[in-house]
């Protein structure tokens, strides 16, 4: 499959946009050095490739957007892995370098004669990739060549830093916002003691750092924080689960700033160790409402509360996608491989026939079966439209009164394109306004999802709330059937009247033992007992002292 990575999807045009999608899963630990990618992906891969191809068709047939200019693309596979994505980005850059040299008349053959070789058009911008860690690596390269990058799901806070990532923009908000949303959920249910897990890599690390910082300010204690790679082996996930179990029964809630495949790894370990139902997972948007995370492990995932970027399904994409067939879809070079993987059958007589499948694919197969649209489809399409609107605005200002590419726009100047992109403001695919702040970020709107058992062996994600620019709304009755069902995740119970908290050395502030004050002491504050002065005694509620009334003894009084 090493050669599979070199496969590229092309669509011709006057201006070429690059794209990086995770057409295949990332390499497993043992295959990383070979950069050998995993199995083909539908939602994160094939659907995004098709979204790019079809969205460009729609843009090209829209007479009001870039009239007389055809947009084309070059789509490459990132395999959700930095090394693979960098290798592919170098290919984008190489195209740009060759064509810019050609513009300057520098393309010469070895024997000195002029070249009739017509190089590929340069890439003017790049859509993607999905992962923050990978996006950072790609941006480090692209910005050296002034190539703007628009991400559709890379949400790391680090990417907001324009001194480091000048040519990076995104149609999604920064993770600082969802970290806040997660803390708000923890606060709502009075979970003061939680375990924390994050995916190793930028998305998880920066997100969890923000979650921990915000938690500390809100008096929420982290029992322990763990990190793990998405592609870690079974044993690593087992060890992590055993560590999380060591904080039970106190830390029932596990906040997971994780990629979807990390969550899946946790669920699989729960199955292997017989731990279904022992934890409540609070997951970030890496999990969201993805079925590929929970498939086969629904029992372990039940009760999970997740954050999902607000993005409704795109109907016109489904209308296009569900009609696709391997006999007619030749422009997507990964489609035959995907079809065989999706239906576990062999496309007999096709160039990419896979002999590992015994069953032959029949003609009645359709993508309508168990179809689930990629939850980030709207963002992928908005990122492509952003690039188109940026180019459109640039054309309007550089080529006034001219339809098509004028000389002033050739070759496309990345600096001017970035300027134009940052000013972009249009109505997105779901009717929301797409705009960018000074950091190239988009505003934060999230849905809160809850993974529930809806009937016998039927599970689904239910929308139970929203978080919009700092305001959390939750339907508590939908999450918990009754108040008493609300999970407790606390280290220590409140102390009773007349007791103070004693925090053991090295323990977090949420864990204490309750000690009663002495007979002549009152509770000065939650950590201190103070003795009443001579002649006074603790009040009934033990919060202060009252003077002892003076009683004078008379000769005839009986003995007390």
């Amino acid at each position: 499959q090493s050669s599979e990575r070199r496969v590229v999807a092309h669509m011709p045009g006057d201006i070429i946009i690059g794209a990086l999608f995770s057409v295949h899963h990332q390499p497993t630990v043992d295959k990383v050095h070979e950069r050998k990618c995993g199995a083909v992906r539908e939602q994160y891969g094939i659907q995004r490739v098709e979204a790019m191809l079809h969205t460009l068709e729609r843009i090209n047939s829209d007479p009001t957007l870039l009239p007389n200019i055809t947009l084309g693309c070059e789509i490459r596979d990132s395999c959700w892995h930095s090394a693979v994505a960098l290798e592919q980005s170098i290919e984008f850059i190489r195209d740009s370098l060759i064509s810019s040299e050609e513009e300057e008349g520098l393309v010469r053959c070895v024997d000195g004669s002029s070249s009739s070789f017509r190089s590929k058009k340069p890439i003017v911008g790049v859509i993607g990739p999905g992962s923050s860690s990978v996006a950072i690596q790609v941006q480090n390269l692209l910005q050296l060549f002034n190539i703007p990058q628009i991400a559709y799901s890379a949400t790391s806070m680090d990417l907001s830093d324009k001194t480091l990532f000048k040519y990076f923009m995104r149609v999604v908000p920064s993770d600082a916002q969802q970290a806040r949303a997660m803390v708000d959920i923890v606060k709502r249910y009075n979970w003061t003691y939680v375990s924390a897990v994050h995916t190793e890599g930028n998305y998880g690390e920066s997100g969890m750092e923000a979650f921990k910082d915000m938690s500390a300010k809100e008096g929420i204690c982290i029992a322990h924080s763990y990190k793990i790679y998405s592609n870690a082996g079974e044993q690593s996930f087992d060890k992590l689960l055993k560590k999380l179990t060591s904080h039970l029964p106190k830390a029932r809630v596990v906040a997971c700033f994780c990629e979807g495949m990390t969550v899946r790894g946790l669920l699989m370990a729960m199955r292997r160790l017989g731990l279904a139902g022992e934890f409540l997972l609070l997951g970030s948007d890496g999990w969201a409402d993805r079925y590929d995370v929970t498939d086969g492990y629904q029992r372990e995932a039940v009760g999970g509360i997740t954050i999902k970027l607000q993005s409704p399904d795109v109907k016109w994409f489904d209308d296009y996608y569900l009609k696709l067939r391997p006999e007619t879809n030749h422009r997507n070079p990964w489609f035959q491989e995907f079809w065989q993987h999706r239906f576990q059958c062999r496309l007999e007589g096709f160039p990419q026939e896979n002999s590992k499948y015994n069953k032959t694919c029949n003609s009645s197969l359709t993508l309508k079966t168990h179809h689930v649209q990629d939850s980030k489809m709207g963002f992928v399409i908005n990122a492509i439209y952003s690039m188109a609107y940026g180019l459109h605005n640039m054309q309007m200002s550089l080529c006034p009164g001219y339809a098509g590419l004028c000389d002033a726009m050739k070759p496309i100047d990345g600096r001017k394109l970035l300027e134009s992109l940052m000013k972009t403001n249009f109505t997105g695919v779901s009717g929301d306004t797409i705009l960018f702040d000074e950091n190239g970020d988009s505003p934060g709107r999230y849905e809160i999802m809850n993974f529930k058992e809806m009937g016998k062996d039927y599970f689904d994600y239910i929308n139970v709330g929203s978080w919009d620019n700092g305001e959390l709304k939750m339907d508590d009755d939908e999450v918990w059937s009754k108040k008493s069902n609300i999970i407790r995740s606390v280290c220590s119970e409140p102390c009773e009247k007349g007791q103070i908290k004693v925090i053991r050395k090295g323990e977090v502030s949420c864990c204490w033992t309750c000690t009663p004050c002495k007979e002549n002491e009152y509770v000065f504050d939650e950590y201190t007992c103070k003795a009443c002065q001579l002649g006074s005694w603790p009040t009934d509620d033990l919060t202060g002292c009252d003077l002892i009334p003076v009683q004078y003894l008379r000769w005839g009084d009986p003995e007390p």
Epitope: D238, L248, R272, L273, G274, L275, A276, G277, E278
Partner: antibody, heavy 121, light 106 residues
């Protein structure tokens, strides 16, 4: 002192049903350790039947036990095992056991003495 | 389903000697294996967990080793009190016991 005591065993007719009870003393169910049933036919080896989480009431069964055996928590100190469609092959000493750690798949740290179930006409 | 195969079914050794019992798992269970000792009419007693960790109160003459699918229990300096049946238990993706090994001390 931590202790598990089983009761409810006895002679039962083939195709009959029986409910066994395990009563825990000196054990705090809130610690989260799972309660399980293991049986041992006369002169034979140990055979795991089922486990239950005292926290979630989730249950785990050996494949052969699904459908005929039901483990449940009836109070904060008792766990039962309901057995139906019994055959001679189910004749065994049924023991209650507590896991060493939280989770259905764990070593068994504490065992009951067992209650004998005899299936015979 | 997880299946544990224990060998031999019976072994005898003299006082002061050593016995070795093997246990094989039908799938990789890493180190998720326990060993028990059971004497007639008594409940099983946990000796080893996580393949090699000694349970509290167990003599250091008892040693567990192995990982993956192959495991071994070794009892050295045999005493008369070691005469019992020993069981292995795999606890990974299920619970399963081996058939048992009877240890006779001469």
């Amino acid at each position: 002192q931590e202790q598990l005591v089983e009761s409810g065993g006895g002679l039962v007719q083939p195709e009959g049903s029986l409910t066994l009870t395990c009563t825990a003393s000196g054990i705090d169910f809130s610690s989260g350790y799972f309660m399980c049933w293991v049986r041992q036919a006369p002169g034979k080896g140990l055979e795991w039947i089922a486990c239950i989480s005292p926290y979630s009431d989730n249950t785990w069964y050996a494949n052969w036990a699904k459908g005929r055996f039901t483990i449940s928590k009836t109070s904060s100190t008792t766990v039962t095992l309901q057995m139906t469609s019994l055959t001679a092959a189910d004749t065994a000493a049924y023991r209650c056991a507590r896991t060493m750690a939280i989770g259905a798949y764990n070593p068994f740290k504490l065992w009951g003495q067992g209650t004998l179930v005899t299936v015979s006409s | 389903a997880l299946v544990m195969t224990q060998t031999p079914s019976s072994v005898s050794a003299a006082v002061g000697g050593t016995v070795t019992i093997n246990c094989q798992a039908s799938q990789n269970i890493y180190s998720n294996l326990a060993w028990y000792q059971q004497k007639p009419g008594q409940r099983p007693k946990l000796l080893i967990y996580d393949a090699s960790d000694l349970a509290s109160g167990v003599s250091s003459r008892v040693k567990g080793s192995g990982s993956g699918t192959e495991f071994t229990l070794t009892i050295s300096d045999l005493e008369c009190a070691d005469a019992a049946t020993y069981y292995c238990q795999g606890y990974y993706s299920g619970n399963a016991f081996g058939g048992g090994t009877e240890v006779v001390v001469k």
